[in-house]
């Protein structure tokens, strides 16, 4: 299709080489079409546009994204060629930063329902640059935490070193929806609830004599509880003896509950005690089996390919630890009788 009629928007993504960060492009269809199509309505319910030249489907996933190769080749379907780019409804998610993401991205509705719709498309010219010198050593992170029940704020990473007075007007989105009342480089939250968690996008306009473009940053915000004051507790094994069959394989599971910690470095391992000897056993990776706001349950198994007589004289010890302290639970194997 002819993209010369598409509206054009220029965006800049300056990424930090120090941290992992994501980026998003919204299918910013021209105002009347967008309101009907992508449900990201900038109008109040009373301000109905006079006419809707694009009568697209209300299904938010009915958008097609393309990339325009720089060598003039035909447009490429994003889904087929770029595994690190994911389409979610009207939004394109870039999972990894890098200058190779620079280029022209075009979105348009899948269903063309009227002659007007042919030109219903947006071309986004994305420039991706690594952050140069440490002009701002303490710039806000692309991952920010809000403590539930307290006051907090979400800062726009690309503007966090500027004072509110000198900061340009900022457009904020949360989970793809415009936050029309927020215009500063920082969103202040009076009391944090779990619904404040989400993906926030901050945009501001930067201009020079030639052109202007939108500088965009994405912030992943999570709502958290305060750090635990407790060491982890072992939920399983409960008993300190276990009946086993000699010569048969055996799996012993260790499940431990770790309270929430912002910097979370859980340790869960198995070691074996044999008289005065102790050694750690390399076992399969630990896996998280349940995760809530307050805690996480982690499991790690030790597998005995077969139980030997010697194993009956050994103690199998599960050791768990967080920043507060550690807990152990030992298991003695006992031969099944009869």
């Amino acid at each position: 299709f002819n993209i010369s009629g598409c509206s054009t928007k220029k965006l800049l993504w300056t990424y930090s080489t120090r941290s992992e960060e994501e980026f998003v492009l919204f299918c910013d269809l021209p105002e009347p079409q967008k309101s009907h199509f992508c449900h990201r309505n900038r109008l109040s319910p009373k301000q109905v546009p006079e006419h809707l030249p694009f009568m697209g489907s209300n299904d938010l996933s009915d958008v097609q994204w393309y990339q325009q190769p720089s060598n003039g080749d035909p447009l490429e379907d994003i889904r087929k060629s770029y595994p690190h780019i994911i389409q979610d409804k009207c939004t394109l998610h870039f999972l990894t930063p890098g200058v190779n993401n620079s280029g022209s991205y075009i979105c348009r509705p899948k269903m063309i329902k009227s002659p007007y719709d042919v030109a219903c498309c947006v071309k986004m010219i994305l420039e991706v640059k690594p952050q140069t010198n440490a002009s701002c050593e303490y710039s806000a992170s692309h991952k920010q935490d809000l403590l539930l029940g307290s006051t907090g704020s979400i800062s726009c990473p690309s503007l966090s070193c500027q004072s509110d007075a000198q900061s340009p007007a900022v457009t904020w989105y949360k989970n793809g929806k415009l936050l029309s009342v927020e215009r500063s480089n920082r969103i202040v939250v009076d009391e944090v609830y779990d619904y404040h968690q989400g993906t926030y996008v901050c945009d501001y306009t930067q201009s020079d004599t030639v052109s202007s473009w939108t500088v965009r940053a994405v912030v992943q915000v999570r709502t958290i509880v305060g750090d635990t004051k407790l060491k982890p507790d072992i939920l399983d094994p409960v008993e300190d003896t276990l009946e086993v069959e000699l010569g048969k394989p055996l799996t012993i599971s260790c499940k431990a509950r770790f309270g929430f910690e912002r910097v979370f470095n859980p340790v869960i391992k198995w070691y074996i005690k044999d008289s005065d000897l102790e050694w750690e056993v390399s076992v399969p990776e630990a896996k998280s089996i349940k995760s809530t706001l307050k805690d996480e349950i982690i499991e790690r198994n030790i597998i005995l390919e077969k139980v030997t007589q010697r194993d009956l004289r050994r103690k199998f010890v599960c050791f768990v630890q967080n920043s507060i302290g550690n807990t152990t639970q030992s298991v003695q194997l006992k031969e099944k009788r009869g």
Epitope: L246, G247, K248, P249, I272, L277, I303, E305, K306, T308
Partner: antibody
Framework: QEELVESGGGLVQPEGSLTLTCTAS?????????ICWVRQAPGKGLEWIAC????????TYYANWAKGRFTISKTSSTTVTLEMTSLTVADTATYFC?????????????WGPGTLVTVSS | DVVMTQTPASVSEPVGGTVTIKCQAS??????LAWYQQKPGQPPKLLMY???DLASRVPSRFSGSGSGTEFTLTISDLECADAATYYC????????????FGGGTEVVVK
């Protein structure tokens, strides 16, 4: 009397295949016993190849270098085979089968006399 | 993979003497170690398992010690019949199975 005997060795061309058989007499393979193959190149040391759990014969274990080219199988309650493919001159060795201690441990307590495999063109 | 390093490669001692063979594991293997004796033209014979347990019908002149990464086989009151090559072997059956032999030590009895 409990015994293990290997058979199937002989001369084979490079890139050829061979299947060795380990036959037990005086006992049959049970789940607590593992049957393993070990080889020894002329004038060299012992090298572990693979093991199989005697009972079901489902669980198998291989040395990293043997994965893909060597396959251990339990073919009856008294026989275990070692199938070898893509053989090279470096595979020339005496191949032993051995039974471990069963419930007493993993060490190899009973050994066959060995069968010689020569890979040569 | 676990690598077993055996020293010395060869040792010579008179009848009645004592021989000490060392085996080092590249990682902590607890006490999951066996020792074998092999004479020319014969299969290996199990001497010790679990580092220090004597196999059946093995004379008490043979003893094993050590744990973790350092292991020792000691043969005291050396006899002519002890002339052979001795191998250590790691046999480890926790969350997978690992087996590896040392390079061997030739014992010559003078």
């Amino acid at each position: 009397q409990e015994e293990l005997v290997e058979s199937g060795g002989g001369l084979v061309q490079p890139e050829g295949s061979l299947t060795l058989t380990c036959t037990a007499s005086g006992f049959s393979f049970s789940s607590s016993y593992w049957i393993c193959w070990v080889r020894q190149a002329p004038g060299k040391g012992l090298e572990w190849i693979a093991c199989i759990v005697g009972g079901g014969g489902v669980n198998t274990y291989y040395a990293n270098w043997a994965k893909g080219r060597f396959t251990i199988s339990k073919t009856s309650s008294t026989t275990v085979t070692l199938e070898m493919t893509s053989l090279t001159v470096a595979d020339t060795a005496t191949y032993f089968c051995a039974r471990d201690l069963g419930a007493d441990g993993y060490a190899y307590h009973l050994w066959g006399p060995g069968t010689l495999v020569t890979v040569s063109s | 993979d676990v690598v077993m390093t055996q020293t010395p490669a060869s040792v010579s001692e008179p009848v009645g003497g004592t021989v000490t063979i060392k085996c080092q594991a590249s990682q902590n293997i607890g006490n999951n170690l066996a020792w074998y004796q092999q004479k020319p033209g014969q299969p290996p014979k199990l001497l010790m398992y679990d580092a220090s347990d004597l196999a059946s019908r093995v004379p008490s002149r043979f003893s094993g010690s050590g744990s973790g990464t350092e292991f020792t086989l000691t043969i005291s009151d050396l006899e002519c019949a002890d002339a052979a090559t001795y191998y250590c072997q790691c046999t480890y059956g926790y969350s997978g199975y690992v087996s590896a032999f040392g390079g061997g030590t030739e014992v010559v009895v003078k």
